[in-house]
């Protein structure tokens, strides 16, 4: 058993059929020493009396709020929650894996640039009595300062029969260098509270890794004489990191129509303009990605082709 | 400790041609590592990111360009001092900072190619001769450290007496493979922000 | 399976011109750009120029630019390259390619051999 | 029009052994360079686009790199199957243009 906060501990449980459980002493948080009881959460049934309690968790329903009480006054709380640990691997019963870029990855966390800002986000489908709480550092045997945010919910999805909902966080580490050379990785934690049971769910990466620029701006066309020929200009997005001439993008200049399986015309280049061929009902699109360091493509910027 | 934006032509640049090639290579390298060791840990996740050219050289802090001179938590510099004339200046206004810098980039390279040589001697006797380092790569740091052009003593290669753990020595080209990338992406970072200015 | 059928090989007076089909199967034609490749004997590739079947477009290679005609009809699944004004240097194997991408070619006809000769 | 030469133009290799091709750009094409494979009396056959991008149905051991105004085809071991002429070509602007291609010959 461990404190989560004040007055909340977490149970760690081998979870399997007749499994023993915990053994758990609560102690009231009190100078009294005669008189107190205890009772567990809305219940008037009283469990045991004196200042300490001894249980025997095996299940969600030994799990809850222990109040102990003298003369119909409250003494204090003690919340347990249940952390599960099935076949020696531990519950993620209450995220989704959302199974992007591998299996069994219930957090997923990008930045815009190398400001040392960056963005979690998880799914689930559960949309009542959950909590979650974010915390994260650089490194993990000498931690160095992350800052994180309340997490909150972002977006709602219909998926089939289920609603999916989905929380993010931002984070800022406290004294980031854009041109360092990252040797620790970022450590985000997330724990996951939904009713009794407790949650954690981690990921480690480095901010070079989960770039994604946002998408190029300011596109313009620009049709040239007596050709099919368009030159098709952008910027870089405000939110990238600055100078430009150090951290250099570079572009996909696509044109296509509205479905993925039509023709296309495709050129890279590391210029802010390119001449590509326009169709009619097409539309020309431009994404972008570190010059150097090949993390993700930011989404497309596009403009219809007439 | 930064770069002014007092610098040479595009023009009279050669080191950013040869910078890109460096990238290049050592990426194509690192990706042939990762392939041929599959069942060695050699991905970003598993290997412990070393810095072989920690506290010897200080080439992000004195490549540094001038816009993030006032970014506080880029400037805990670590003194290193370097000998100044290479041949990528090309210009007589090239200024101290500048010439710091791409010496310090020069360091790091004869820092790695020192290592680079002396892992490929031991993987060289490899019975089971499963990989090696790529002629190229070390061709190109050569080309690099030729049109960087600084002279400083040689270090001599590092020779080992003792039998080679070729399990070790591959785990650590896997290391030192990921370091030099995340170098060589600050090099060549540097040099378009030269070949700019 | 995508397949470029072309015409048979032809012989040319200089001065003249010729006409090379290339029947396409697999696929709708209109879905991809269809391009035109030359080889002289014992040379490399040389690029004429390109069509979308599905509105007519073409662009051309500067040069052979006024001299070479590209056009398709949907109807039959069929372009065809037309080249005027045909000299010597101009005996060639000559490739129709197609690909959904318009700017290099992810399959090939199998030739047709043009031979310009008094 | 974009300049593209290939080196060498011939290069004998004994089975088994790589083989490396050099395709240089006359100005920068960024990645917009793909590799092809003839063999006499066929038509050429798609190895890579994009510099790097492997097609499916080609056997791994044909590779690409490069970006800017140098690239490479790596054959890591050469079949002798691959005894054959291999040419680069630019997409970066029209006209589109070609390598003068590199002989691939038995040592």
């Known amino acids: 058993i461990w404190e989560l906060k004040k007055d909340v501990y977490v149970v760690e449980l081998d979870w399997y059929p007749d499994a023993p459980g915990e053994m758990v002493v609560l102690t009231c948080d009190t100078p009294e020493e005669d008189g107190i009881t205890w009772t567990l959460d809305q219940s008037s049934e009283v469990l045991g009396s004196g200042k300490t309690l001894t249980i025997q968790v095996k299940e969600f329903g030994d799990a809850g709020q222990y109040t102990c009480h003298k003369g119909g006054e409250v003494l204090s709380h003690s919340l347990l929650l249940l952390h599960k640990k099935e076949d020696g691997i531990w519950s993620t019963d209450i995220l989704k894996d959302q199974k992007e870029p591998k299996n069994k990855t219930f957090l997923r966390c990008e930045a815009k640039n190398y400001s040392g800002r960056f963005t979690c986000w998880w799914l689930t489908t559960i949309s009542t009595d959950l909590t979650f709480s974010v915390k994260s550092s650089r490194g993990s045997s000498d931690p160095q300062g992350v800052t994180c945010g309340a997490a909150t919910l972002s977006a709602e999805r219909v998926r089939g029969d289920n609603k999916e909902y989905e929380y993010s966080v931002e984070c800022q580490e406290d004294s980031a260098c854009p041109a360092a050379e990252e040797s620790l990785p970022i450590e985000v934690m997330v724990d996951a509270v939904h009713k009794l049971k407790y949650e954690n769910y981690t990921s480690s990466f480095f901010i070079r890794d989960i770039i994604k620029p946002d998408p190029p701006k300011n596109l313009q066309l620009k049709p040239l004489k007596n050709s099919r020929q368009v030159e098709v200009s952008w910027e870089y997005p405000d939110t990238w990191s600055t100078p430009h001439s150090y951290f250099s993008l570079t572009f996909c200049v696509q044109v296509q129509g509205k479905s993925k399986r039509e023709k296309k015309d495709r050129v890279f280049t590391d210029k802010t303009s390119a001449t590509v061929i326009c169709r009619k009902n097409a539309s020309i699109s431009v994404r972008a990605q570190d010059r150097y360091y090949s993390s993700s493509w930011s989404e497309w910027a596009s403009v219809p082709c007439s | 400790r930064n770069l002014p934006v007092a610098t040479p032509d595009p023009g009279m640049f050669p080191c950013l041609h040869h910078s890109q090639n460096l990238l290049r290579a050592v990426s194509n390298m690192l990706q042939k590592a990762r392939q041929t060791l599959e069942f060695y840990p050699c991905t970003s996740e598993e290997i412990d990111h070393e810095d072989i050219t920690k506290d010897k050289t200080s080439t992000v802090e004195a490549c540094l360009p001038l816009e993030l001179t006032k970014n506080e938590s880029c400037l805990n510099s670590r003194e290193t001092s370097f000998i100044t004339n290479g041949s990528c200046l090309a210009s007589r206004k090239t200024s101290f900072m500048m010439a710091l810098c791409l010496s310090s980039i020069y360091e790091d390279l004869k820092m790695y190619q020192v290592e680079f040589k002396t892992m490929n001697a031991k993987l060289l006797m490899d019975p089971k001769r499963q990989i090696f380092l790529d002629q190229n790569m070390l061709a190109v740091i050569d080309e690099l450290m030729q049109a960087l052009n600084f002279n400083s003593e040689t270090v001599p290669q590092k020779s080992s007496l003792e039998e080679p753990d070729f399990y070790k020595t591959k785990i650590k080209l896997c290391i030192l493979l990921h370091a030099f990338r995340i170098r060589a992406v600050t090099i060549d970072r540097v040099m378009s922000y030269l070949n700019a200015s | 399976q995508v397949q470029l059928v072309q015409s048979g090989a032809e012989v040319k007076k200089p001065g003249s011109s010729v006409k090379v089909s290339c029947k396409a199967s697999?696929?709708?034609?209109?879905?991809?750009?269809l391009h035109w490749v030359r080889q002289a004997p014992g040379q490399g590739l040389e690029w004429m120029g390109w069509?979308?079947?599905?509105?007519?477009?073409?662009e051309y290679a500067p040069k052979f630019q006024g001299r070479v005609t590209i056009t398709a009809d949907e109807s039959t699944s069929t372009a065809y390259m037309e080249l005027s004004s045909l000299r010597s240097e101009d005996t060639a194997v000559y490739y129709c390619?197609?690909?959904?991408?318009?700017?290099?070619?992810?399959?090939l006809g199998q030739g047709t051999l043009v031979t310009v000769s008094s | 029009d974009i300049v593209m030469t290939q080196s060498p133009l011939s290069l004998p290799v004994t089975p088994g052994e790589p083989a490396s091709i050099s395709c240089r750009a006359s100005q920068s094409i960024s990645i917009n360079l793909h590799w092809y494979q003839q063999k006499p009396g066929q038509a050429p056959r798609q190895l890579i686009a994009f510099a790097s991008q492997s097609i499916s149905g080609v056997p791994s051991r044909f590779s690409g790199s490069g970006s800017g105004t140098d690239f490479t085809l790596t054959i890591s071991s050469l079949q002798p199957e691959d005894f054959a002429t291999y040419y680069c070509?630019?997409?970066?602007?029209?006209?589109?243009?070609f390598g003068q291609g590199t002989k691939v010959e038995i040592k």
């Open positions: 697999g696929g709708t034609f209109s879905d991809y750009y």
């Open positions: 390619a197609r690909n959904k991408e318009l700017r290099y070619f992810d399959v």
């Open positions: 070509q630019q997409s970066n602007s029209f006209p589109l243009t």
């Open positions: 069509i979308d079947p599905e509105n007519g477009d073409t």
